[in-house]
């Protein structure tokens, strides 16, 4: 891919209820299993069909999980992170970071690569400004006709 790849980064609180077969997803990452270079965070690598996460619909492959029931996932060994999910109880609250590619092709979730992103307002503000300018120019043009 040519050029720089930028991302929209948004955070969301997702509350899942553990289903008959559990939460229904896989994770990668941790201090001993870096999935993204220079980032030991925990990422979703697979959403299982018909599992609790899939049925809820908000958690996506490539999402970074920041905390579980308020407990930070920073600087954890991979197995410790797995155990944290397994012992999280029936109702599980996930703080999740979604990263959407906004340049170089169609928008899509990214599970790997540059973990840095750009805040959503840095994209939306210029887009809004351009829209306003275009609308103003159009109105001026119509008045001249």
């Amino acid at each position: 891919m040519n050029g720089r790849v930028d991302y929209l980064v948004t955070e969301e609180e997702i509350n899942l209820t553990r289903g008959p077969s559990g939460l229904g997803f896989n994770i990668v990452g941790g201090t001993d299993q870096q999935y993204v270079s220079n980032d030991s965070g925990i990422y979703v690598s697979r959403i299982k069909e018909n599992g609790a996460a899939a049925l809820d619909g908000r958690l996506q492959e490539g999402d970074k999980i920041l905390s579980v029931n308020g407990q930070d996932l920073k600087n954890l060994l991979h197995q410790d992170a797995v155990d944290l999910f397994r012992n999280a109880g029936y109702a599980v609250s996930l703080r999740v970071q979604h990263r959407l590619q906004v340049q170089n092709g169609p928008i899509g979730h990214r599970g790997e690569g540059d973990p840095s992103g750009i805040p959503i307002f840095m994209v939306l503000v210029p887009v809004f400004a351009l829209t306003m300018v275009a609308a103003w120019a159009f109105m001026r043009y119509r008045q001249q006709l």
Epitope: G22, F25, I27, V28, Q33, V44, R46, Q79, F85, R86
Partner: nanobody, 127 residues
Framework: QVQLVESGGGLVQAGDSLRLSCAAS????????MGWFRQAPGKEREFVAH????????YYADSVKGRFTISRDNAKNTMYLQMNSLKPDDTAVYYC?????????????????????WGQGTQVTVS
């Protein structure tokens, strides 16, 4: 997409040994949770062995415990199945299987549905 290629099968005598290999594509091999399954003619696919991402945790079917050893080399993107004291009952097509990452639920490692990618299989015949 993950590609898996098994090798090492063949025709051996009862009591002999074989070592199967499963070579996998992808730069994130060290995150894969992996397993071996087998299928004899006219039978269901059967769990053989499982290994976690680091190789620190393994599980075996009762029928192969003490005879088979599963291992992996993350530097070579390869998983192995060392099969000793082979019996005619071990005759089957052997498949390696992969899921990316570790399930956050108690892992049902013997369930084929837990795995996303499968190799084409390698035939093991014990006479």
């Amino acid at each position: 997409q993950v590609q898996l290629v098994e090798s090492g099968g063949g025709l051996v005598q009862a009591g002999d040994s074989l070592r199967l290999s499963c070579a996998a594509s992808g730069r994130t091999f060290s995150t894969y949770t992996m397993g071996w399954f087998r299928q004899a003619p006219g039978k269901e696919r059967e769990f053989v062995a499982h290994i976690n991402w680091s190789g620190s945790s393994t599980y075996y079917a009762d029928s192969v415990k003490g005879r088979f050893t599963i291992s992996r080399d993350n530097a070579k993107n390869t998983m192995y199945l060392q099969m000793n004291s082979l019996k005619p009952d071990d005759t089957a097509v052997y498949y390696c299987a992969v899921t990316i990452g570790s399930p956050v639920d108690s892992y049902r490692h013997s369930d084929p549905l837990e795995y996303d990618y499968w190799g084409q299989g390698t035939q093991v015949t014990v006479s």
